[in-house]
Interface confidence: medium
């Protein structure tokens, strides 16, 4: 008999190269493959559970970054008056939680932030609970 | 034929308010539906394998803390006068281990530390391994 | 109907106490039950996918670390002039990489650099996609 | 393909308005900041005014500060400049660039200011 | 404001010959984290500016190899490698680490 095979864990990486002032960071998944998606500049989660979440980049100018999931809750990050981040976390989503980021510059500069190196990752730590597709 | 279904992953996700010097933080569970559990102000290992675990906090005042997991064994974390904690670690765990705090406060104050924020996670990364229920 | 179990995952912890200058750090893993292997004194990595980096350890003297995993690629972790290291990381790696250390000492010296706590440790995170043993 | 189409220049006396809009084509506009460059007639390159890709954040250059504004339609996909108090030294051609580091331009589109 | 200054303000070339125009800031456009903003533009007469080159040596899209852009720190050099005749007009470099973006005077290409 053929052992079981795991489903595919719900995981994404996602880029982004600029973020707007008082908006967030355009970003875009630079493979077919992944099993979560993205809509309006948002991570759709469609399972309940514990995420790891890895955010990286080095920004053109300083700026404060948050990382919302749902309105009216605090942050999964929030960074204040940096030039990078390099985080790691885990967070408790759910469906219909969509992870999205808000971004303040300092400067009164109308500019997009160049970032290199942008990448946010979200990887579901609780396979085989509540998913709705 | 319906694909294998994921047994669910152990992971428990406990919350603290209040930590007592020379003694350790009183955890609670907030879901009825975690697959780990708590006991006796420890969290009870039943599986062996990796753990992510996640230990944030806002303490108001200044304590050094530690998280164990066996006696005679160093700690998973160890922090020394701080008013804040936000860790990330990975450790190996094992049946029979109990996952809990020690704290040491440095006033004379008698009076229990309040915490903002207090959670630590565990997810367990090797489903498949030895488990004992 | 017996639930179906999970294969095991792919992770791997190894232990090193010395690196040498201009080379890398020597590692060993202490379990034969590790479901990842060492060779060439690199970790061999058979499944694409996201994996949990954990790195940590105490060094004798001063040095700058990196730790790869593809000539040619940027490295998964980069350490300039310090005396220890206490990091995690998420990074997706793929079948044929290798994960291996560089190491430079500061000093003039010829001498291997002693390690406290030398642990590398990688967790595979997307079961379920492709492997090849 | 990326396209910038300006339109609005004309002849106009000093203390006189114009308003130049730029229609932009070929890029999801309403995800780009956008920019106003002038060139004075046998002169260099001068950024006028910047907006945000939200209409939320300008720049503009001391020179016209309190005369100019800039303003963005995402539903038309199109960016203005409003020009107040025209004073002769405003005479040139206008371009409307995408992003803030230009890189596209537009045909331009040239306003002379004079009696 | 950051002033930038081009060298020579004019040259004359003959086609499959090699140009250089320089480009120098009145401070370092290098970033705390690597980057730099210097970038480089062509106008050809009776043409609207078109962008050749980004971050001091990054090409533009449909920009030839021939071009090519180098520096750091303030000084800075746009090079082509065989001049064609299509490439007479005004070249302006410009930076962008700081408001407002600036360019410089322009160098007039003429090929002989």
């Known amino acids: 008999q053929v052992p079981p095979q795991y489903p595919p864990i719900q995981s994404i990486r996602v880029q982004f190269t600029r973020c707007e002032n008082e908006k967030g960071c355009i970003i875009t998944s630079p493979s077919k493959d992944e099993t979560m998606k993205v809509q309006d500049n948002s991570i759709i989660i469609n399972c309940d559970g514990f995420y790891l979440i890895s955010l990286k980049g080095y920004f053109s100018e300083e700026l404060s970054l948050s990382l919302y999931y749902r309105k009216g809750r605090g942050p999964l990050f929030s960074l204040s008056k940096v030039t990078s981040v390099d985080s790691i976390g885990v967070a408790y989503l759910a469906f219909k939680d969509k992870v999205y980021f808000n971004v303040t510059t300092h400067s009164t500069s109308y500019k997009d932030i160049q970032v290199n190196g942008g990448e946010l990752i979200l990887i579901h730590q609780n396979p085989g609970g509540f998913c709705a597709y | 034929q319906v694909p294998p279904q994921y047994p669910p992953i152990q992971s428990i996700r406990v919350q603290f308010t209040r930590c007592e010097n020379e003694k350790g933080c009183i955890i609670t569970s907030p879901s009825k539906d975690e697959t780990m559990k708590v006991q006796d102000n420890s969290i009870i290992i039943n599986c062996d394998g990796f753990y992510l675990i996640s230990l944030k906090g806002y303490f108001s005042e200044e304590l050094s803390l530690s998280l164990y997991y066996r006696k005679g064994r160093g700690p998973l974390f160890s922090l020394s006068k701080v008013t804040s904690v936000d860790s990330i670690g990975v450790a190996y765990l094992a049946f029979k281990d109990k996952v809990y705090f020690n704290v040491t406060t440095h006033s004379t104050s008698y009076k229990d530390i309040q915490v903002n924020g207090g959670e630590l996670i565990l997810i367990h990364q090797n489903p498949g391994g030895f488990c004992a229920y | 109907q017996v639930p179906p179990q999970y294969p095991p995952i792919q992770s791997i912890r190894v232990q090193f106490t010395r690196c040498e200058n201009e080379k890398g750090c020597i590692i060993t893993s202490p379990s034969k039950d590790e479901t990842m292997k060492v060779q060439d004194n690199s970790i061999i990595i058979n499944c694409d996918g996201f994996y949990l980096i954990s790195l940590k350890g105490y060094f004798s003297e001063e040095l700058s670390l990196s730790l790869y995993y593809r000539k040619g690629r940027g490295p998964l972790f980069s350490l300039s002039k310090v005396t220890s290291v206490d990091s995690i990381g998420v990074a997706y790696l793929a079948f044929k990489d290798k994960v291996y250390f560089n190491v430079t000492t500061h000093s003039t010296s010829y001498k291997d650099i002693q390690v406290n706590g030398g642990e590398l440790i990688l967790i595979h995170q997307n079961p379920g996609g492709f492997c090849a043993y | 393909e990326v396209q910038l189409v300006e339109s609005g220049g004309d002849l106009v006396k000093p203390g006189g308005s114009l308003r130049l809009s730029c229609v932009a084509s070929?890029?999801?506009?309403?995800?780009?900041?956008m920019s106003w460059v002038r060139q004075a007639p046998e002169k260099g390159l001068q950024l006028v005014a910047g907006i945000n890709s939200a209409g939320s954040s300008t720049y503009y250059t001391d020179a016209v500060k309190g005369r100019f504004t800039i303003s963005r339609d995402n539903a038309k996909n199109t960016v203005y400049l409003q020009m107040n108090s025209l004073r002769a030294e405003d005479t040139a051609i206008y371009y409307c660039?995408?992003?803030?580091?230009?890189?596209?331009w537009g045909q331009g589109t040239l306003v002379t200011v004079s009696s | 404001h950051i002033v930038m200054t081009q060298t020579p303000l004019s040259l004359s070339v003959s086609p499959g010959e090699p140009a250089s125009i320089s480009c120098k800031a009145s401070q370092s456009l290098l970033l705390s984290y690597g980057n730099t903003y210097l970038y480089w533009f062509r106008q050809k007469p009776g043409q609207s500016p078109q962008r050749l080159i980004y971050?001091?040596?990054n090409r533009d899209p449909g920009v030839p190899d021939r071009f090519s852009g180098s520096g750091s720190g303030t000084d800075f050099t746009l090079r082509i490698s065989r001049v064609e005749a299509d490439d007479a007009g005004v070249y302006y470099c410009?930076?962008?680490?700081?408001?407002?973006?600036?360019f410089g005077q322009g160098t007039k290409l003429e090929i002989k």
């Open positions: 660039a995408k992003r803030w580091v230009f890189d596209f």
């Open positions: 410009g930076q962008g680490i700081q408001d407002p973006f600036t």
């Open positions: 070929g890029f999801i506009f309403s995800s780009y900041s």
């Open positions: 971050k001091v040596s």
